[in-house]
Every structure is written in structure tokens, then in C-alpha cells.
């Protein structure tokens, strides 16, 4: 009678997370009598996965009916596989012992590799907004994938970026892995509508990569350009001065009119017009009663945009040519408006 052999025909098995792994094992003899046990790992720290005779193993089912006469198929199925189940599984024949069973012979082992999908990439940008021509960093993270091989690409508006660094952790063997990438992006004034995309390709995704996006509208600040102009005289003693605030983003903006350095009026941009590139324009008027001034007037349009230090533009209003009206207490009539509300 030939001595019993334990045969594990598969050196390795690859299973997708959530699926069922089948680990094959056959014995060549019924003798010696005794249970088959399955272990993950070898040596004293090995983990018992299944014992034919003792204990309950709810995740494990046998492929064949072990109670059938002459059964020598000890293959098992492990349900709902997770990356934590990865490892080498050994089918071990024990000889019935008294009081304890004695290990008799082990199979060569089957390495179970678990294919786990990466999580949806999460892209995050800088904490503070930045202005055009500045370089900002975006990070992309994805977790829980296996095997380790993974491809990550960055795009800005469909154009692939090259300035990025990527790390996959841990470096050594692990049940699952994480990827972290940082890309550098140079902002332009046209980037309000731009998107940065992180694309992750992995064997589990069957050619359909996962994408994470960040809108540069969350990152960019386009400072306004100011232009102060004097409109033709509406009445003999009135001058209409406009401050054109152009190409700014985001919308948060406060405008202050100063007459010779004194605050005349403050207003917040409300009804703005949007440009094709996503930036905004806004206009404010100041109606100046020139008869109230003896000297020239310095009008300043001061704009505070998105909490940044104010920028301003001034205009000198010549009043010497206008006759002085005596007894006038009002220096200026203030009217704030915009392009849609001209009166």
C-alpha cells in the first residue's frame, strides 16, 4: 500500500474581492484515517481555516460530500473573500490520535491572491486660493487595491500632465495597497472652468479606469482690472464717473468710492455679468455734483476682492471750468449701479 500523498494541484489562485475562492486538495488514500485541516500560513503561527472534524467554519464549505464513502476530495470554498484573506493555504492530513490527532502530511500549498478594486480617487487642492501664473499642488488618493500594480495619470482639461510624483504604500508585501500622488499645476487666467482629473487604472477595473476630479474654480483667484472713466456731463453741474471692474473670480467683491480720500460710498457686487471664461465683470457709477467743489476732485475706486488687500484706481476730476454754486451743502449725489441698471 502506497503512503498517502496530499495533492494541492494549484500553486496559486486569484480571486476578486467579494467572490468565492476554491482551494483544491485531494488525498491519494483513506489511510491513515484522520481529518484534513486547512491552514493559512505555516509554522507555529499558522491560522486554522477549516477542520473536517472539529469546530464550525461558517465561511467555508466543502466542494464534495466528505461523508461519501471513499471520498478523497478535501477541496474547500471560502466565501466573501477580502484582501485580508490573501496568503498561502495548506491542506494538511492528520492521523487520528489519542488524545490528539497528529499531523501526518501537508500539501505543497496554494497561494491565494485577492484582486481588490481601488476606492474612487479623491482629489484635493490647496487650502487657499492662488492667482494665475502661480503653481499649485493637487493630491489624489485611492485605497484598498490589490495586487500592487497600478497606473495613475493626471489631466488638466483632457491634456495629460507630467509634473507629478506618485507613491504606492506599503513598499513590501501587504494584503492591500494605497496610492498617493501630488501634481503641480500652473494656473492661468482662463482656468475658472478648468478641471484637474486623476485617473487610476487597475487590473480589477477591466479597462474602465476610475476618475477623481477637482474644479479649478475652487482653487483659482483672478484679481480684477480696474478702469475709472468720466462720462459726458449729464447736467450742467453733474459728472458721471464709472468704475469698470473686469475679469475677476470669485464673485466676492466690495467696492468703495473715495472723494479726495474720504469714503463716499461702499457697495458689494451683486448683479454681475459672467464672461465666457467664467470670470465676472461689474460696473459702478458715481454721480458727482461738481458745483459743490471749489477745487479739483480726486475720485478713487477701491476694490477689495475675495478678502485680499484692496486695489484702487483714481481719476482727477477738473472742476475749475464749472461755475461755483453758492450755498450748496451736498458735495456729491451717490448712485451705485451696474451695466444692466443704468439710469
Amino acid at each position: 500500500e502506497e503512503e498517502l500523498q496530499v495533492i494541492q494541484p494549484d500553486k496559486s489562485v486569484l480571486v476578486a474581492a467579494g467572490e468565492t475562492a476554491t482551494l483544491r486538495c485531494t488525498a491519494t488514500s483513506l489511510i491513515p484515517v484522520g481529518p484534513i485541516q486547512w491552514f493559512r500560513g505555516a509554522g507555529p503561527g499558522r491560522e486554522l481555516i477549516y477542520n473536517q472534524k472539529e469546530g464550525h467554519f461558517p465561511r467555508v464549505t466543502t466542494v464534495s460530500d466528505l461523508t461519501k464513502r471513499n471520498n478523497m476530495d478535501f477541496s474547500i470554498r471560502i466565501g466573501n473573500i477580502t484582501p485580508a484573506d490573501a496568503g498561502t493555504y495548506y491542506c494538511v492530513k492528520f492521523r487520528k490520535g489519542s488524545p490528539d490527532d497528529v499531523e501526518f502530511k501537508s500539501g505543497a500549498g496554494t497561494e491565494l491572491s485577492v484582486r481588490a478594486k481601488p476606492s474612487a480617487p479623491v482629489v484635493s487642492g490647496p487650502a487657499a486660493r492662488a492667482t494665475p501664473q502661480h503653481t499649485v499642488s493637487f493630491t489624489c488618493e485611492s485605497h484598498g487595491f490589490s495586487p500592487r500594480d497600478i497606473t495613475l495619470k493626471w489631466f488638466k482639461n483632457g491634456n495629460e500632465l507630467s509634473d507629478f510624483q506618485t507613491n504606492v504604500d506599503p513598499v513590501g508585501e501587504s494584503v492591500s495597497y494605497s496610492i498617493h500622488s501630488t501634481a503641480k499645476v500652473v494656473l492661468t487666467r482662463e482656468d475658472v472652468h478648468s478641471q484637474v482629473i486623476c485617473e487610476v487604472a487597475h487590473v480589477t477595473l477591466q479597462g474602465d479606469p476610475l476618475r477623481g476630479t477637482a474644479n479649478l474654480s475652487e482653487t483659482i483667484r483672478v484679481p480684477p482690472t480696474l478702469e475709472v472713466t468720466q462720462q459726458p456731463v449729464r447736467a450742467e453741474n453733474q459728472v458721471n464717473v464709472t468704475c469698470q471692474v473686469r475679469k475677476f473670480y470669485p464673485q466676492r467683491l466690495q467696492l468703495t468710492w473715495l472723494e479726495n480720500g474720504n469714503v463716499s460710498r461702499t457697495e458689494t457686487a451683486s448683479t454681475v455679468t459672467e464672461n465666457k471664461d467664467g470670470t465676472y465683470n461689474w460696473m459702478s457709477w458715481l454721480l458727482v455734483n461738481v458745483s459743490a467743489h471749489r477745487d479739483d476732485v480726486k475720485l478713487t475706486c477701491q476694490v477689495e476682492h475675495d478678502g485680499q488687500p484692496a486695489v484702487s484706481k483714481s481719476h482727477d476730476l477738473k472742476v475749475s471750468a464749472h461755475p461755483k454754486e453758492q450755498g450748496s451743502n451736498t458735495a456729491a449725489e451717490n448712485t451705485g449701479s451696474n451695466e444692466r441698471n443704468i439710469y
Epitope: 469546530g55 464550525h56 461523508t67 471513499n70 487520528k96
Partner: antibody, heavy 121, light 111 residues
Framework: EVKLEESGGGLMQPGGSMKLSCVAS????????MNWVRQSPEKGLEWVAE??????????HYAESVKGRFTISRDDSKSSVYLQMNNLRAEDTGIYYC????????????WGQGTTLTVSS | DIVLTQSPASLAVSLGQRATISCRAS??????????MYWYQQKPGQPPKLLIY???NLESGVPARFSGSGSGTDFTLNIHPVEEEDAATYYC?????????FGGGTKLEIK
Amino acid sequence: EVKLEESGGGLMQPGGSMKLSCVASGFTFSNYWMNWVRQSPEKGLEWVAEIRLKSNNYATHYAESVKGRFTISRDDSKSSVYLQMNNLRAEDTGIYYCIRDYDYDAYFDYWGQGTTLTVSS
Amino acid sequence: DIVLTQSPASLAVSLGQRATISCRASKSVSTSGYNYMYWYQQKPGQPPKLLIYLASNLESGVPARFSGSGSGTDFTLNIHPVEEEDAATYYCQHSGELPYTFGGGTKLEIK
């Protein structure tokens, strides 16, 4: 340590009923087929009944001499096996052993000490 | 049913000698190369104790002086050298098919 302990034996009149119980300990009861074997001076050792596992749908088998009169059952949650005996006859007299079948092949590796049934008028 | 006939019904063997007990089945109890025959020892007031499984394999904890052989319909239990504690009744049992049956027993006496 594997232990099998029978109870329920005693003196019964012909035509009567009796239920034998066997409580198991020291092993995972639900993983083993269980059997009853009886012994008498007249008939020697006689296999009576077998009950298999849940995965076998608790299949049962009986000796021809007790078929239709005896019922074997098990309660895995109580690690117990039972033998309900109806319409008892004098020839059912004997020591009833509760037995563990180690390898699903009438491999009777552990026997209880037995409980005695006497059927007599 | 498969009938198992044991012989002799009793025998007396001197200490240290060989005891041989025979069991003949009315039909083969062998399938797929395995012989579904078992041997038990029973002492007074105790349940039977398994000695040999599948005709020739020693149950764990059983002394090596016990051995089994045979196939098909003819099987033998040997005890050598016999010791005093071996005085008992020996039974063969098959599991070739249902119902399982036992031999009538062989009583071994030590001289």
C-alpha cells in the same frame, strides 16, 4: 476527552414505549454520524440505527428488526442523540450503546457505557 | 444482510504465544481497494473497544501486538505475543453495506 452517556433504560412491558437519550461531550457533535447498537446474550451485538449530519439532511437508517417501531433523532444544539422505541417486544431486551462513527463508515471509535432495557410482562 | 461467521467461538492461548481469530463474510466487504472490516475487543461489564479499522490499520492507542489482515470475504485478527490483559471477547464488524452486522464473537482465554 470524548464522552457518551446514555440514559432512559429500564423495565417495560411489551407494547410499551420508551425513549433513550445520549449526551455527548469532548468533540464537535454536529460533525459526526451517531449510532445505536444493542447487545443481548441471545443475539450478541446488533446494530440498530444510524443518523447522519445536517449536510446529509439528517438521513436515518435502521435494522430491519426495528424499522417502523424505532426512531433515531438528534439535537446538535444539545449534543444529544435519541432513540424513540415504540411497540416494544421481548426481543428488544438488551444493553443499548450510543456510538460515535468517526469516519462515516461505521467506524465505531467511541462507545458509551450503555443503558439496559428489559421488556417483560 | 451480510453474515459474519467468526471462528473459533473460543480459544485458549498461552502467554506470549500467537492468537489467531478468523472472520468470514457471506459476501465481499471490499470496494475501491478498501476492506470495510473492523475488529473490537470487549471485556466483561465494558463496551466494545475498536482495535483495527479497514481490515489492517491499527486504531490509535492500540498496542502493536494486534494486527489485522485479509480482503474480500476472509479476514484475520492476530495477537502476538498474547498478554494477560488480552483475555476478552473479540468481534468483527463490517460496513460493506447497510445494515452493518457483527460476528458472533470469539472468547480468548489466556493459559
